[in-house]
């Protein structure tokens, strides 16, 4: 999980977060969490290992805490197998200087 450019400079700017699964799991389903709450879900195309979550401006006003990714794949008997949560990513904004 990582923040990708363009980086937000204020709480109104969009946030872009990339999440990647290991090589065994292209086409995985990804869930982005913030402070333990689901923010967005995306499925990678079958030929891709990751996704980029694009959060519209103001998303940073959602419940606080760092962002985490989790990916899931369908296993035997069509049961979803989930990864551990990723390392956290924190989004910070520059302090304005007047």
């Amino acid at each position: 999980i990582r923040l990708v450019p363009p980086y937000p400079s204020s709480q109104e700017d969009p946030i872009h977060i990339a999440c990647m699964a290991p090589g065994n799991f292209p086409g995985a389903n990804f869930t982005l969490y913030r402070g333990g709450q689901v923010v967005q879900l995306l499925q990678a195309p079958t030929d891709q290992r990751g996704v980029t979550f694009n959060l519209s401006g103001g998303s940073s006003k959602a419940p606080g805490g760092p962002f985490h990714c989790q990916y899931g794949v369908l296993g035997e008997l069509n049961q979803s197998q989930l990864s551990d949560l990723s390392e956290p990513v924190n989004v910070s904004f520059p302090v304005p200087t007047w």
Epitope: M20, P22, Q48, R49
Partner: antibody, heavy 116, light 107 residues
């Protein structure tokens, strides 16, 4: 420690097939995919294909489609690459690699020479 | 398919120099880029993945940066053992293409 040990060098005639093996140790075999990469003498790295140890899915570079087959055997922790209809320009070192978030463990390479 | 172009193809430098190698992708690949080092007669070695994450055991003089279509590998102070060929690779979309390589030689 994590290790990939490949089978020995091969000399083949044009039109023949070759099957290279790659035995993994030091980690859980089914948690990581494999890719195969080749390098012709004096040239760069060329990705050939990928196989998931999770479900056996494969993806191949278009130029090798129909000529290469990747398989794995989780009972022996071994991955295989078979290349058919060999040509002289298939002469190269063939590497198996553990495919995680990148290619983090490489085999020592297997030299395949195609010559009449 | 995505194309990767490395520059320069050849680089001559001295021990202690700071060197930068660039890898450009023909379309956006997020931060899904890796860098490898290869010495003659040996298998490549992973240096950096996810554009900027240093692989365990790799000296901190190696660093990576970039996102989207432009990426760089920087060696802050060249050591004698760093003279080798360097490859970038995209891991965003299959096929998992490599750049053509940059040969780094002693000046």
């Amino acid at each position: 420690q994590m290790q990939l040990v490949q089978s020995g060098a091969e000399v083949k005639k044009p039109g023949a097939s070759v099957k290279v093996s790659c035995k993994a140790s030091g980690y859980t075999f089914t948690t990581h995919a494999f890719s195969w990469v080749r390098q012709a003498p004096g040239l760069g790295l060329e990705w050939m294909g990928w196989i998931s140890t999770y479900n056996g899915n494969t993806k191949y570079e278009q130029k090798f489609q129909g000529r290469v087959t990747l398989t794995t055997d989780s009972s022996t922790n071994t991955a295989y690459m078979e290349l058919r209809s060999l040509r002289s320009d298939d002469t190269a070192v063939y590497y198996c690699v553990r495919d995680s978030r990148a290619f983090d463990v490489w085999g020592q390479g297997t030299m395949v020479t195609v010559s009449s | 398919d995505i194309q990767l172009t490395q520059s320069p193809s050849f680089l001559s430098a001295s021990v202690g120099d700071r060197v930068t190698i660039t890898c450009r992708a023909s379309q956006g690949i997020n931060s899904y880029l890796a860098w490898y080092q290869q010495k003659p007669g040996a298998a490549p070695k992973l240096l950096i993945y996810a554009a900027s994450t240093l692989q365990s055991g790799v000296p901190s003089r190696f660093s990576g940066s970039g996102s989207g279509t432009e990426f760089t590998l920087t060696i802050s102070s060249l050591q004698p053992e760093d003279f080798a060929t360097y490859y970038c690779q995209q891991l965003n979309t299959y096929p998992l293409i490599f750049g053509q390589g940059t040969r780094l030689e002693i000046k």
